[in-house]
Amino acid sequence: EPPTACREKQYLINSQCCSLCQPGQKLVSDCTEFTETECLPCGESEFLDTWNRETHCHQHKYCDPNLGLRVQQKGTSETDTICTCEEGWHCTSEACESCVLHRSCSPGFGVKQIATGVSDTICEPCPVGFFSNVSSAFEKCHPWTSCETKDLVVQQAGTNKTDVVCGPQDRLR
């Protein structure tokens, strides 16, 4: 009886269970009553990452420098090339097909998480007791200066964008 289902790493064609081609190889000829499946290695700059019956290998991804991309990991016959972004840029999607500049956190906001090649800067508002007076992709919110530890008093209250201003203690009682 011809099979209706095949084992793992096989496929059914013309009532025959044929071996799939291993990762890194493409199908040249299906198996027959007389022959095993014929497979050939993928060429330079090509890959197949699964057991397959593909007659063409996939092209490695091109990391286009004009889009701010560079190679993070070179592709093999079994894996695609992995792109990442140049310093100061991050991917616009999981597939990393293009890059955008890391965003800066405005005054009043600090960096919660520094950007990577694949994720943008995450900003957070400076809470009470902290401030940021610059637009930056690296600076966290800084704590207000503690006037007391310098034996000074607060002359001007701090905000989320400015530090406190300390001054000498008023000696007149």
Epitope: N14, S15, Q16, S19, V28, S29, D30, T32, E33, F34, T35, E36, E38, T55
Partner: antibody
Framework: QVQLVQSGAEVKKPGASVKLSCKAS????????IYWVKQAPGQGLEWIGG????????NFNEKFKSRATLTVDTSISTAYMELSRLRSEDTAVYYC????????WGQGTTLTVSS | DVVMTQSPLSLPVTLGQPASISCRSS???????????LHWYQQRPGQSPNHLIY???NRFSGVPDRFSGSGSGTDFTLKISRVEAEDVGVYFC?????????FGGGTKVEIK
Amino acid sequence: QVQLVQSGAEVKKPGASVKLSCKASGYTFISYYIYWVKQAPGQGLEWIGGINPRNGGTNFNEKFKSRATLTVDTSISTAYMELSRLRSEDTAVYYCTRHGNGVYWGQGTTLTVSS
Amino acid sequence: DVVMTQSPLSLPVTLGQPASISCRSSQSLLHSNGNTYLHWYQQRPGQSPNHLIYQVSNRFSGVPDRFSGSGSGTDFTLKISRVEAEDVGVYFCSQTTHVPWTFGGGTKVEIK
């Protein structure tokens, strides 16, 4: 239905060349190898080699490799075998055959090599 | 090359009686994929070969069930349970496990 139709009988002189054809119909030509088999008068069968019409890849019996050339013309679903530097021992019936989902043979081409 | 040896060379048979043909290979025909690529076919006088059995024991579509194949490794047999007049011809075994593919010398089946 699948059919393999071979070219007509040939008579050649020793040292000459001959090109036999095998026209396929009734299936997708590039999906299956075409093989060639020799049967000398009153003799058994000898496998010459095969060609994959998808990419032109060939495999051969070493005995025939230096004198047999296998080609295809996918636009007319035809396979060819050219045999060069003919000698009297090449006198035989030559079959083309295809397998995969059944086995199919051409009707054979008779080649006579005689001075 | 793998040598395929068939016996007998000639097999006179009586209609309705069984017949058996042996085929031995000079090396094992078990492929690394687990299949054994040993095949049988018939050639009637003046005709192209006609395949009967593939991979030792699988009948091609349309082949009568009086034909059966068996064996493993290097030793194989084709049996005809009850010979009919149309079974006259030469029977060949062949192997496609090893390149070059090779054929047995043939067994001529004739009616007594």
